[in-house]
Every structure is written in C-alpha cells, then in structure tokens.
C-alpha cells in the first residue's frame, strides 16, 4: 500500500503495474537467447554477452548501464594436455582411463568451446597411490575414518562423492587428512532420482555426466591475489604461493560410469554403516587400496590445468531514485556459466532481464522508484564469487553508507515443487506479505496464494501456519554484501520436494546437460515457476525501493537471536563440567538478547506512531532500520576469516553453502573435547560469547531513541 505513495506515481504505477508487466513468454525468450553457447568467465563469448545485456538494459530504459572490469585469477584446463585419471598396473601401464569429456547433448554436437569437466584451481600434478573412499568427505566422515576406523589417509588419493557440502570443504578436509589427491564423483544415490530418465529423456544425470566447480576455500576474499581490494589496473597482486584459498593437491571430477570402475575394485575395510553406501553396484569398501587380485594396481591422476589472471566484466545498471537517490536497493545475479547455464545461472539472468524490462517500462511512463535500484550481471561467480566481490570491494564505502538491501538472482529453479527463501530476519515480514499477494503457480492451488502453497508444502518447523525461511549461507553473490558489508540480503527460487528427493542440488548441476531444453521440456514448460520467482524477486525489490518506511521488522531479529542463543547454549551444555571449571557463562549473551527484544519492541511501536510527513524523522527511522544489519558487523571479522564479519551469521566452516548462527561461538565449541589445551580453548569460547553479547547489545542500542 505504501508503494503507491512513491514520487510521480499514478494509480497504475504501483506494485501491481510492475508485476503485471512481467511475462513468462519473455523470460522463456531471454533464457533461450542466453543459453545457445557457453559463457565461461574470462572468455570472449561472455564478454559479448555482457555487451549485449548492457545494450538491452539501456534500451529497456535504465538511466545508465556500465561495464565494470577486473583482472582476476581464473583457472582453465590445458587444451592440448587433457586432465584424466587412470588405473595403472605394477608396470606403470594405464589399464583404464577416465573420459576426457562429456558426450554432448543432442543438438549441441558441433558447439565449440565446451570446457571439459575439471576442478577449477586444482594445482598441476600426477600423484599415484592407493585409493581411500571417504564418503562425502565431510568433517564427520574424516572423524569416522581416522578416529573410529583408524584409517590413515596420509599419502593416499581419496575418492569422495559430491553432495551434502560445498566441494571446496571436501578438498580442504582431504588436505588436512594428508591426502595427495582428490577424485570427486556424482553417485546416483545423490544425482539420480528414482523413476526419472537420464537426460535427454529426463532430468537425471547420465553416467557420463560430470559436475564442474571451483574447489577454493576463499572465505569471502574474492580474487585470490587481491584480498580486500579490487583487482583493478593498479592492483598489487600476491604471488601465487601467497594467494588466498588455493588447494594444494590435485583434484578432478568424474561421472558415475568412471567411478564404478574405480570403486568396484576397492578392498580394505567395509563401509562403517549404510550411510556410506551409494547406489552403484559396488561394495563401497573404504580401502585403502584395491582388493585381492588388483592389490598391486594403483590410481594415477594427470592434472595439467593452469591458473591465469584474466579480465572479467560485470554489467551495472542504474535506475535513479526520485526521493532518496543515495539509498541503493540492489538486484544482482551472475552471467557466467560452466557450459550452457540452462539453470545456473541463466534461469536467474533471464528473470533479472525481465524485471529490468518491467521497471524500464514504468520509468518510460514517467515513474521512478523512491530509492535508487542497481541491477548487476556478475561475472566469474563460478570461480569464487569474483565479479560481485571485486565490485563490492571497489565500492565498499558507498555500499556501507548507502546500501539498503541486496536481492540475489542466481538460478530461478532447482525444482518445481515449491518456493525456497533464504534471507535476513529483517525481510521475513516482507516475504510473508508479498507472497500472500501473489498467486500460486502450483497444481492444486489454483486461486490460492503463493503463501498458502508454500506454507503447505514447506511448513516452518517452529511456527504453525508459516513457511520455512532459511538462514543465508554462502556459495553465491550475496556473500560479500551480507557477510562482509552487513547489507540486508535475501534470495528466492523454486525448489524440489526435499522430503522425497534426497539428491543434492539438481542432478544435472554444472554439467553439459544443463541446457535450455532441460528447463523447457522437464522443469517449467510454461515458465510459470520462473514468472513466480520473477514476481517474488521483483516484488521484493519494488517494495524495498519504493515503500515510504523500509519494510524491515526488527522484532523478527529478536526472535531468532533468542533461538540462536538457546541453540548455542544447548551445544555448550554438552560440556557442563568444563563450563563450570572455566567459568563459562552465557548470562551476558542472554541479557543482551533480552535487551534487544525490549528495544526492538519499543522501536516498532515508535515506527507505527511517528509523523511520516516529516522527511527528517522519516529518514532517521529508515536509517535506523537500514543500519541494523550493519550493526551486526564486527570490523575484525571472525577468527581466521577476516572477510566473514557478521557476528550472527556466517557460512559454516564445514560447509560453505550452509549458514551457521553465532559462528564465532559455534566454531570455538566445535570438537573442543579434542583440543590439546582445554584452558585456551575454553578461553576462546568465553571471548566469543563476549564478542557476541557486545555485538547484540550494540545493535540493540542503534534502535534506541537517538536522544
């Protein structure tokens, strides 16, 4: 309702006008246009697409559209010296080699520049040795291997199945365990949904399909050679030995046909339990090494990829705000893909394109948003969120003073079952209210709201009659805005039914088979789910940019802070004696949370009552809302992770994709019983409680009456 009060508005120039202008047919057309050839970061094809998007955004009516370029470290296979893995006999002869490429999908046989499957930023090397199967290579999998099964991975090549956690964490864990190489593979248990055919006849992963992806552990640093600063023309670059987050051992991904050949010969220990078994017809023995007749055979990796400083291009479009041009609402998603990008990222980029077109249409009719909207097409997301991070580093001073919100727009779909939202608690009420006004695209929910179908299919585990909204983790371009800069952020997409489909991500993720046809034939033939996601993302941007009072509810932060404090306290109570011995108390944290709750409640009351016609008071109240997320930023960052500065949320140290609450305390408590110096370890727990309590209290005080 408040949106109608924006400047230059006429009755038709409201949220409804914006939403009605969004068309499924346009999204379909844009997706087709963006997916006909590969758009790998750092390539000419992706530069050309950047220029095309720049041109079209200008045509759509944005005030300005600029390219922002950076020279960052990227990684590519050697075109003349392909990567592969072999089984070698005792004479060193290669008796089996993994495939060098994925069989191209129908209609794409003659497309050039399809990058073969590789693990981006793998060092070169040709290690050979015995194989150890390490399940998903999670922290707990290595605990099981090393502590319970007494299996030593030192000097071994480990083979891990994709899924559950970010691949970079798998590689880090393998390195810490002493492995000399890592083979990543897609197990049908995780990437082949029962009852569905393989591509091109369905949306499942064929045996020759392989997931590409970077294996960095950047922890928010951006370009590995210029952490903290933009990779511009006068940048000082670190030497490769000092680069941030690069793996130290060779890594390579394979499909399940090739994995079968490696795993079927495995000997040594049996799998510890059924959770270590996938769906291949192999014993899933852990090793080390091959069984009986094959015990003299070894595995050898041949990795020849190179790291190269390469130019990348972001497209930045601006729609100037009429009333508060110095307040920025940002909608951003990446443009670069591993191959065709049918889902990742172009299902998102096509939605952004249509949102820009709709905003442009309104602007051409004389309307402007209250606040400035920035649109971004990021480059090199697949290589470590590089484009978004470099741009944010370059513009950090503006962003920290002017950034209202960031809405992410990567893949619009990872399924077609229901909505999935991850966002700051400040946006909960915005998302609830918006989805109540949108129509559900779901079968069986005709005439019902999106909120209703979403709540029915994905209920909150805590609040009856409400949908599940998850914590922000990382692995996408919101990271720098939320985790480093403290700008309120959110993301939305359509997802699968997590209850019935236990596979990780979607089966064809980062493979050559992620095509336009995959989406058009199997996921969203009518593009109705894409349209719904456009309405959610676009609707959020519209409200954030246009409502008189920012649509943030600080009381929802109070609720989650209590929940997170309860959770971390419960974890600490696994060690009640040590808590006593080292005088560990959570009193300060719970007191701060209580204060935050009371102050947030009073602020909300004032927000209802203040004189909205007074521009100074309005701006003051809005600034308190805008800067609340910023108040959770600790300038010193988290231990050993200086670019993760949000005290309430950070990507899990064990899985970049997942969000962890009170991450400083959580990490200090993690596996504390194994620490060699308990006094020091519990001292760090106490320090982290202190930091968290101080931060919550300080954030609360930003909501107090200013004088």
């Amino acid at each position: 309702k408040s949106s109608n009060e924006a400047t230059n508005i006429t009755p038709k120039h409201n949220m409804k006008a914006f939403l009605d202008e969004l068309k499924a047919e346009n999204i379909k057309k844009f997706l087709y246009n963006f997916t006909q050839i590969p758009h790998l970061a750092g390539t000419e094809q992706n530069f050309q697409l950047a220029k095309q998007i720049q041109s079209q955004w200008k045509e759509f009516g944005l005030d300005s559209v600029e390219l922002a370029h950076y020279d960052v470290l990227l990684s590519y296979p050697n075109k003349t010296h392909p990567n592969y893995i072999s089984i070698i006999n005792e004479d060193g002869n290669e008796i089996f080699n993994t495939s060098l490429f994925e069989p191209p999908p129908p209609g794409y046989e003659n497309v050039s520049d399809i990058v073969p499957p590789f693990s981006a930023f793998s060092p070169q090397g040709m290690p050979e040795g015995d194989l150890v199967y390490v399940n998903y290579a999670r922290t707990e999998d290595f605990f099981k291997l090393e502590r319970d099964m007494k299996i030593n991975c030192s000097g071994k090549i480990v083979i891990a199945r994709y899924g559950k956690v970010f691949r970079g964490n798998k590689v880090k864990n393998a390195q810490l365990a002493g492995a000399k190489g890592v083979i990543l593979y897609s197990d049908p248990a995780d990437y082949f949904a029962p009852g569905v055919k393989s591509y091109p006849d369905g949306w499942n992963l064929p045996g020759g399909g392989v997931q590409r992806g970077n294996i960095l552990n950047l922890n928010g640093a951006g370009d590995p050679l210029t952490p903290g600063y933009p990779a511009n023309e006068y940048a000082y670059r670190r030497g490769i030995a000092e680069a941030v987050g690069l793996p130290s051992i060779p890594v390579h991904p394979i499909g399940y046909y090739d994995a079968q050949k490696l795993l079927e010969k495995m000997g040594g220990s049996a799998p510890p339990d059924s959770s270590w078994r996938g769906s291949l017809k192999v014993p899933y023995n852990v090793g080390p090494g091959f069984t009986g007749n094959f015990s003299t055979q070894k595995v050898k990796m041949h990795i020849h990829s190179t790291n190269e400083v390469t130019r990348i291009y972001n497209v930045i479009g601006t729609l100037r705000g009429a009333v508060e041009p110095d307040r920025y609402v940002i909608l951003g998603g990446h443009r670069d893909s591993w191959v065709f990008g049918g889902i990742d990222p172009q299902s998102g980029a096509a939605v952004v394109h249509e949102i820009v077109r709709s905003f442009g249409t309104l602007k051409k009719e004389g309307w402007r948003p209250r606040r400035t909207i920035l649109f971004a097409s990021w480059d090199a997301e697949e290589f470590g969120l590089l484009g978004s991070t470099e741009w944010a580093e370059e513009n950090s001073r503006l962003l920290q003073e002017r950034g209202v919100a960031y809405i992410n727009a990567d893949s619009s779909i990872e399924g077609n079952y229901t909505l999935r939202v991850d966002c700051t608690p400040l946006m909960y009420s915005l998302v609830h209210n918006l989805t109540k006004e949108l129509k559900s695209p779901d079968e069986g929910f005709e005439g019902k709201s999106l909120y209703e179908s979403w709540t029915k299919k994905s209920p909150s585990p805590e609040f009856s009659g409400m949908p599940r909204i998850s914590k922000l983790g990382s692995g996408n371009d919101f990271e720098v805005f939320f985790q480093r800069l403290g700008i309120a952020s959110g993301r939305a997409r359509y997802t699968k039914n997590w209850e019935t489909n236990k596979f990780s991500g979607y089966p064809l993720y980062h493979s050559v088979y992620e095509t336009y046809e995959l989406v058009e034939k199997f996921y969203d033939p009518m593009f109705k789910y894409h349209l719904t996601v456009a309405q959610v993302r676009g609707g959020m941007v519209f409200e954030l940019a246009n409502s008189i009072v920012l649509p943030f509810d600080c009381r929802d932060y109070a609720v989650v802070l209590r929940k997170y404090a309860d959770k971390i306290y419960s974890i600490s109570m696994k060690h009640p004696q040590e808590m006593k011995t080292y005088s560990v108390s959570f009193d300060s944290l719970f007191s701060a949370v209580k204060n935050f709750t009371e102050i947030a409640s009073k602020f909300s009351e004032r927000l209802q009552d203040f004189d909205k016609s007074n521009p100074i008071v309005l701006r003051m109240m809005n600034d308190q809302l805008m800067f609340l997320e910023r108040a959770f930023i600790d300038p010193l960052g988290l231990p050993d992770r200086p670019f993760y500065r949000h005290v309430i949320y950070a990507p899990s140290s064990h899985n970049k994709y997942a969000g962890e609450s009170f991450p400083g305390i959580y990490d200090a408590l993690f596996d504390i019983e194994s620490k060699v110096d308990p006094s020091k370890a519990w001292g760090e727990v106490k320090r982290q409680i202190y930091v968290a309590a101080f931060t919550v209290q300080a954030a609360a005080e930003t909501l107090s009456e200013v004088a």
Epitope: P461, K563, S570, P576
Partner: antibody, heavy 117, light 110 residues
Framework: EVQLVQSGAEMKKPGESLKISCKGS????????VGWVRQMPGKGLEWMGT????????RYGPAFQGQVTISADKSISTAYLQWSSLKASDTAMYYC??????????WGQGTLVTVSS | QAVLTQPPSASGTPGQRVTISCSGS????????VNWYQQLPGTAPKLLMY???QRPSGVPDRFSGSKSGTSASLAISGLQSEDEADYYC???????????FGTGTKVTVL
Amino acid sequence: EVQLVQSGAEMKKPGESLKISCKGSGYNFASYWVGWVRQMPGKGLEWMGTIYPDDSDTRYGPAFQGQVTISADKSISTAYLQWSSLKASDTAMYYCARDSYYGIDVWGQGTLVTVSS
Amino acid sequence: QAVLTQPPSASGTPGQRVTISCSGSSSNIGSNTVNWYQQLPGTAPKLLMYSNNQRPSGVPDRFSGSKSGTSASLAISGLQSEDEADYYCAAWDDSLNGYVFGTGTKVTVL
C-alpha cells in the same frame, strides 16, 4: 506455540518392554535438550536424564543409568524413553521436558505407565 | 533422589503471604540458578520462576523468588485459591551433572 505432546497411558506386565514418545512442535526440536522426569504416585519429581536430539548425545541420572534408554529422532521431532524389562516399581507418571538456558521451561502432559501382573 | 529440601506443606488464608524455602548445597543452589515449578492437581508441572527471581510472561507478580548462598525461597503474596498446588524448586547439580528437584511443598489455601 511451543509444545511437547506425549504418547498415551500404558498398562504393562512385569518383564515386558515399553517405549513412550514425546513429540515437540513450535520450536527447533533438534537444538534443545529434552529431558525425562519421573513422578511416582504421590511423590516428587526425579530427573532421569536428557538427550540432545541433534546428535543424540545422552546423559542419565545416577539412579537411572542402565535402567532406561533415552533416544530421539530429530527428523520427526520426537524423543523416546524405553524399558527392556519393566518392573512394578516403574509405575509412575513420566514427563518429557525441554531444557534451555532458563532451565526446564516446557513440559509434556505426562504419560502414565502402570506395571502390574 | 531429591537433594533439595523443602517443607512438606505450607498454608495461608486468601490474601496472606506464604513463603516456601528450598535448601541445597554448594554443588547445586550454591553455584547455579534456581527455578520454581507449580503443579496443579492432576496436571504437569509448569515453570513459575527462572533464574532465581525471573517470572515467565503470564505468571502473576504476586509470585517472587530469591536466592542466598545455598538456599532459595519462593514467596506468594496475596494468596489466592487458584494457588493451591504443589511447588518444587530445582537446580542444576554440578557433581551429578543433572537436575535435582526439591522434595515438594503442598500449598493449601485455607
């Protein structure tokens, strides 16, 4: 609304096994310890033990160690208390209860277990 | 198994003030906070007071708690008929690594 809902009353014979349940709702079940408390007829409250559903870390009161088993299934937000061989002296009301920083703050409605030949 | 000692009963007429004591040791009350629970006839216990003297929302302010050393007490001022119930104190015990409850006090409104 934060709630713990327990399974219904049980009438058993000595030597029989039993498993009673406690289902949580209205909060993140996996992130809070869930304890069990016994109240024998006409008597006071006795703390039996507790479980952290997220990883099934379990603690028992000295009098109950080896006498009962506490377990949980976080996927269905349910905690359990079980006996492999009941005795007449196990006749009591059993409460599950959520434990937080503020102590035992939410209680189930109780499950009456009667053991008689 | 109760290690906290309470008087078995207490009584008063409506409007009177009633106090219940709870005595423990250094390993429980002496080093941890005390909670109080009210158990109305035929119902489950309910949290009445946490952290020695904090009332959950919905608990009338006629209930108050305090702690000193290894003892705690619950006071009901302006006793009402609906206060007729059993009252239990509880605290974490560091040596047992678990909760200990009081023996319970039956409050009767005369």
